[in-house]
Interface confidence: low
């Protein structure tokens, strides 16, 4: 827990009047169908709302959509459907919002059956105006913006053509046919897979991976026998069919596909899959599915080149390809990830790592909770978190875990306390130290969101009945106030606040139902008068992240450095403000064996920090394949963890010698694959 806090609940004065003056209702002139909401830009206050309603007629379905715009964080909305010529917008494509603060929006319209192409509406002024553009193709996917230049768009057509626009959708050019999947890389590069023999499905495993660095003027084939590809951090991954059988292997490139190395990961068969769980510029978490329909696999963490992998977690819960995993990056504290494992008895348990996958442990039991019926020992149990898997199983879990980079240390999640995840109705738990300790925050399932960089937490009870009450806390979930935001309860459908958790506005969405009709309604509440003053220096306290033993000189060291943060005191009721920047002071730690992962050919026995040689490789020369050349590895078993900044202390030696021998373990010359290298 963050130090120096007043545990007593102090009520916020006169909050009902303050909130009532800042509650804005908007009733939408719409029959209830579906509604989607998008924020346009950062700190602009601009929200677009698209409502769609399908009227089933005898022979066909007639669709109607309306577009609304707010420029004050949802307090007021204006119907701007006339700007898109009252056209029916296809909700499956959503609203394609441009990156950063480009102010760009693309809406894809429904067109009649016989048209030669689709239609889009484009805005580059935060949806003040739209231009209608008829496309020379029917889009299969939403328009994808280049992360580097929002004028560059790509889309796939229903005919599997890859189309590119260089002027924000004004003019389109088909740069390649027979394309299965296309993605933007860095430097406005496009990666895509192509098929030769008829279809993406038929050619799976025989696809080619292409790259264009000049928006389709020229191309380079960078891979063959491709099953699929993915981008993560600075890594490009391809899963490639082996020559001899139906297995696949992962190959990795850190230079946009010019050179490839075979990842030291198990190969997978037809029914298995690989999944990039998380990636940054330092490393990648890779899930490798187990053979058979087990519903689990193994998490591996990579070295800095994405080539050598260490086993991180066994029996990692991940249902079939494209299925559910609970893997969650806790963005409020560096190095922390939460996920679920499937134990031998088929119960599901939550595990947490604080060091980027180096070690996993159970979550500590919350102080204010009892062990439930799943616990064999009523005094010893853990907190288990509900995430995507629970939601997919239709458990009473309205939201996945929540953390925000600028609300340091805060994690909010539904959970149960026992030996495994329970199917009973969950409660909401909060951690204020990045997952080391937990407290029950709210009884029963709730929707929740973080405002003002953690200065306010807002929650609404998950109920099948209409609601009219919102709860809020100004002390990181210790004490709660309730506010009745409307006299007439509404059927609640969602909470919306501006991404980034810097806003002080929350929008409550729902619909009213009367005998004749139902209508969409939103209530936007501004909490600015609750936090009536700006925070000052005295409102913050110093907090050492990852601190477990204050007596230890190396306390707080994770990945080679420790960080002290300025945290808002729980007792301070003030505004961090929209310009709030997390203040942190890093300091480098001495290296210990914990700062190294086991090198190729080595592993760490359980509960041991030393790396020992794999028995099957003892006495063999360690040779592996890198960029198509055979390398000889002289090592005593350690390699520094990617992103680890430690200095001094222990310093295991390793040396890689280029054997100047071609080993083409990579798929650039698949006919010469050398099995020795793996």
């Amino acid at each position: 827990s963050a130090p120096g806090e007043d545990e007593e609940c102090g009520r916020v004065r006169d909050f009902v009047a303050k909130l009532a003056n800042n509650t804005h209702q908007h009733v939408f002139d719409d029959l209830r169908g579906s509604v989607s909401l998008s924020w346009v830009g950062d700190s602009t206050g601009v929200i677009l709302v698209l409502t769609t309603f399908h009227v089933p007629l005898v022979i066909m379905t007639f669709g109607q959509s309306k577009l609304y715009r707010s420029e004050d964080y949802g307090k007021n909305f204006k119907d701007i459907t006339d700007l898109i010529n009252n056209t029916f917008i296809r909700t499956e494509f959503g609203m394609a919002i441009g990156p950063e603060n480009s102010g760009k929006v693309v809406l894809t319209a429904e067109v009649s059956g016989g048209s030669r192409g689709g239609r889009i509406f484009r805005s580059s002024d935060f949806a003040k105006n739209f231009v209608q553009t008829d496309l020379p193709f029917h889009p299969l996917t939403q328009m994808m913006y280049s992360p580097q230049n929002s004028d560059y768009l790509l889309a796939l057509s229903t005919e599997n053509g890859l189309w590119v626009s260089k002027n924000f959708g004004g003019k389109w050019e088909e740069i390649h046919k027979a394309v299965c999947l296309a993605k933007w890389g860095s430097d406005n590069t496009i990666f895509f897979t192509t098929y030769a023999n008829g279809s993406c499905k038929a050619d799976l495993g025989a696809l080619e991976l292409w790259r264009t660095s000049d928006l389709g003027k020229s191309f380079k084939t960078i891979g063959v026998k491709i099953y699929s590809f993915g981008l993560g951090g600075r890594f490009l991954f391809a899963s490639v069919m082996a020559d001899k059988d139906t297995t696949r292997r992962i190959h990795v490139s850190t230079d946009q596909g010019d050179t490839w190395s075979m990842a030291q990961l198990p190969s997978v068969g037809q029914e298995q899959f690989y999944s990039i769980l998380a990636a940054n510029d330092d490393m990648v978490f890779m899930h490798v599915d187990e053979p058979g329909d087990t519903g689990f696999g193994t998490i591996f963490t990579s070295d800095d080149r994405g080539i050598v992998y260490s086993k991180s977690l066994d029996r990692h819960l991940y249902t079939t390809t494209g299925g559910e995993t609970d893997f969650t990056n806790v963005t409020s504290l560096r190095g922390v990830y939460i996920t679920s494992v499937l134990s031998e008895d088929n119960s599901i348990q939550t595990m947490i790592t604080f060091d980027q996958g180096g070690r996993w442990t159970h979550l500590r039991k919350p102080e204010n909770s009892e062990c439930d019926a799943t616990a064999k020992n009523k005094n010893e149990c853990s907190l288990h978190i509900h995430a995507s898997y629970s939601i997919s199983q239709k458990l009473n879990v309205p939201m996945a875990p929540l953390s925000e980079p600028n609300a340091v240390g805060i994690v909010i999640a539904h959970g149960s306390v026992g030996d495994a995840i329970s199917v009973m109705v969950p409660d909401v738990y909060i951690s204020d130290d990045g997952g080391y300790s937990w407290t029950k925050m709210l009884e029963g399932p709730h929707y929740y969101t973080i405002l003002d960089s953690g200065g306010i937490i807002v929650a609404i009870e998950h109920s099948s009945r209409p609601i009219n009450v919102i709860k809020f806390s100004t002390d990181e979930g210790q004490c709660w106030q309730t506010y009745t935001f409307t006299r007439d309860p509404i059927y609640f459908t969602g909470l919306a606040s501006e991404p980034g958790a810097r806003s002080m506005n929350i929008s409550i969405w729902g619909f009213t139902e009367s005998f004749l009709t139902s209508q969409w309604v939103s209530y936007t509440i501004d909490f600015k008068d609750i936090l009536e003053r700006n925070c000052e220096e005295k409102d913050y306290t110093i907090w050492l992240a990852h601190s477990t033993d204050p007596e230890d000189y190396e306390d707080g060291c994770i990945l080679g450095y420790k960080e002290q943060f300025l945290r808002l005191r729980k007792s301070s009721v003030c505004q961090n403000g929209r310009d709030y920047v997390v203040t942190k002071q890093p300091s480098i730690c001495l290296c210990s064996l914990e700062d190294f992962l086991c090198d190729f050919g080595y592993y760490r026995p359980e509960n041991d920090s030393k790396c020992v040689e794999q028995p099957e490789l003892k006495g063999h020369d360690l040779e592996f394949c890198l960029y198509g050349r055979e390398e000889h590895l002289t090592t005593n078993g350690y390699r520094k963890i990617p992103g680890d900044k430690c200095q001094g202390g222990v310093n295991p030696v390793r040396e890689v010698k280029d054997l100047k021998k071609k080993c083409t373990s990579n798929f650039l010359s698949p006919e010469k694959q050398n099995s020795k290298s793996n």
Epitope: N188, S213, S218, K220
Partner: antibody, heavy 117, light 108 residues
Framework: EVQLVESGGGLVQPGGSLRLSCAAS????????MSWVRQAPGKGLEWVAT????????YYPDILKGRFTISRDNAKNSLYGQMNSLRAEDTAVYYC??????????WGQGTLVTVSS | DIQMTQSPSSLSASVGDRVTITCRVS??????LAWYQQKPGKAPKLLVY???NLADGVPSRFSGSGSGTDYTLTINSLQPEDFATYYC??????????FGQGTKLEIK
């Protein structure tokens, strides 16, 4: 019209250094990879270095690694080649070329580097 | 590294002739090959990329063919301005992206 103009060549003593420049115009410089290629008198073409469009990735043949550094300044539409520890066998015309991926589609007129004592 | 063997190293031909230059590669480069023309004292000029695609402004008498490890540049009906040195270059996989040693085409 695409134009690439090299400069910075000249006479240099063995062991010396030289910085080549290439000024690009007539195209969007920051979406293209760029390369240096050289040609010794009376000999064939030899690839020297390549840099990706954003300058993130650089490539060299093994024989030049450590002695040749390619860099670019996209704000100035310029490509550079820093040559160190020059030897007589580095004497050549050095060309800068636009390198979009599967070919080098536009070349400069070249700049002559002579390494001699 | 991938080896490029260009042949012949030189050949003589007359205006109007059909000429073929070949480039053999030490391993499959999946059509990632370009052809260039260079005249004395001038910079190389791209003729063909991706083995078969004619670069902008290149006359249709030039054509590229081949796949796998064997590639060919053909000039139909040789013109006076075609007498030059021709180079192939691969762009497959691992650098170095080597050039062939060149073929000098001379007037007979």
């Amino acid at each position: 019209e695409v134009q690439l103009v090299e400069s910075g060549g000249g006479l240099v003593q063995p062991g010396g250094s030289l910085r080549l420049s290439c000024a690009a115009s007539g195209f969007t410089f920051n979406i293209y990879g760029m390369s240096w290629v050289r040609q010794a008198p009376g000999k064939g073409l030899e690839w020297v270095a390549t840099i990706s469009s954003g300058g993130i990735y650089t490539y060299y043949p093994d024989i030049l690694k450590g002695r040749f550094t390619i860099s670019r300044d996209n704000a100035k539409n310029s490509l550079y080649g820093q040559m160190n520890s020059l030897r007589a066998e580095d004497t050549a015309v050095y060309y800068c070329a636009r390198h979009p991926g599967g070919a080098m589609d536009y070349w400069g007129q070249g700049t002559l580097v002579t390494v001699s004592s | 590294d991938i080896q490029m063997t260009q042949s012949p190293s030189s050949l003589s031909a007359s205006v109007g002739d059909r000429v073929t230059i070949t480039c053999r590669v030490s391993e499959n480069i999946y059509s990632n090959l370009a052809w260039y023309q260079q005249k004395p004292g001038k910079a190389p000029k791209l003729l063909v990329y991706a083995a078969t695609n004619l670069a902008d402004g290149v006359p249709s008498r030039f054509s590229g063919s081949g796949s796998g490890t064997d590639y060919t540049l053909t000039i139909n009906s040789l013109q006076p301005e075609d007498f030059a040195t021709y180079y192939c270059q691969h762009f497959w996989g691992t650098p170095p992206w080597t050039f062939g040693q060149g073929t000098k085409l001379e007037i007979k």
